[in-house]
Amino acid sequence: EDELQVIQPEKSVSVAAGESATLRCAMTSLIPVGPIMWFRGAGAGRELIYNQKEGHFPRVTTVSELTKRNNLDFSISISNITPADAGTYYCVKFRKGSPDDVEFKSGAGTELSVRAKPS
């Protein structure tokens, strides 16, 4: 069977400060089992933006219902964007593990740029 792919269709997204940004992400398979996380940046310094498994992420809403059976859409919307939100966002699939989940595959990233709010 084909190995799961993480698809982030947009290389870049530009929004005005104060608006919401939609970052798209889709999986090609339900396997392996494990959560999705979104990060801004890569490597050790990356910021956790959303964790499907746990935590409270008040500015993030999921575009589709992630708990829905057979859901493959893991797109998110981030509200009230500020200049500090600019950066490259990665949708990352984790494989369920014990005790910790293991990073399995990352999308190619979507660069979010923030325009000054129109006056």
Epitope: A44, P58, R59
Partner: antibody, heavy 119, light 108 residues
Framework: DVQLVESGGGVVRPGESLRLSCAAS????????MNWVRQAPGEGLEWVSR????????DYAESVKGRFTISRDNSENTLYLQMNSLRAEDTAVYYC????????????WGLGALVTVSS | ETVLTQSPATLSVSPGERATLSCRAS??????LAWHQQKPGQAPRLLIY???NRATGIPDRFSGSGSGTDFTLTISSLQTEDSAVYYC??????????FGGGTKVEIK
């Protein structure tokens, strides 16, 4: 309930070192950025340092850069501040503060730990 | 760097009266402004975030308004327990996170 409890404060001489700890409970510690904020006697609040949720990304105020190191142990739900080459002007109450999301305000504060640097 | 200027430095208000505190930013911070209350000998406590939203458990006599560069914290009917220093914090541009110099609210 969210609880943040600092420890490790005390009296040291200029040039000496001290390590502060902040024990966190009541929330998913590994999902949130954390900060240290200090308050000199009779003065206002001064942000000192921030660490991202995973621990690999750090930021410092210019006044402490190169002398202070922030770190965290997500398995122990603990935040640290290693303070080296302490100066009289570092005398303050040091608070650990939880960040609401990756780019946000501080929604919970610890009770503080007093650090006194005096010869 | 964004500088936050709070005024007045001290505000003396009688119980039951309205207290109005100001925070002005040197450049726009959108709605990314929080207010914290610090009572004597205590840690700060979040009151208001995103300029207008009350934090969990904060009485409705506290309200925030403003956007851009000019913000106001209003205590509609001052209680004796509201005696404290109030700090504004911006989180539009960072690092560094910036706090205002504080406004001390005294009970007449």
């Amino acid at each position: 309930d969210v609880q943040l409890v600092e420890s490790g404060g005390g009296v040291v001489r200029p040039g000496e070192s001290l390590r502060l700890s902040c024990a966190a409970s009541g929330f998913s510690f590994s999902s949130y950025a954390m900060n240290w904020v200090r308050q000199a006697p009779g003065e206002g609040l001064e942000w000192v340092s921030r660490i991202n949720s995973g621990g690999g990304g750090t930021d410092y105020a210019e006044s402490v850069k190169g002398r202070f190191t922030i770190s965290r142990d997500n398995s122990e739900n603990t935040l640290y501040l290693q303070m080296n080459s302490l100066r009289a002007e570092d005398t303050a109450v040091y608070y650990c503060a939880k960040q609401y999301d990756w780019n946000g305000f501080f929604d919970y504060w610890g009770l503080g730990a007093l650090v006194t640097v005096s010869s | 760097e964004t500088v936050l200027t709070q005024s007045p430095a001290t505000l003396s208000v009688s119980p039951g009266e309205r207290a109005t505190l100001s925070c002005r930013a040197s450049q726009t911070v959108g709605s990314k402004l929080a207010w914290h209350q610090q009572k004597p000998g205590q840690a700060p406590r979040l009151l208001i975030y995103d300029a207008t939203n009350r934090a969990t458990g904060i009485p409705d006599r506290f309200s925030g308004s403003g956007s851009g560069t000019d913000f106001t914290l209003t205590i509609s009917s001052l209680q004796t327990e509201d005696s404290a220093v109030y700090y504004c914090q911006q989180y539009y541009y960072w690092p560094p996170y910036r706090f205002g110099g504080g406004t001390k609210v005294e009970i007449k």
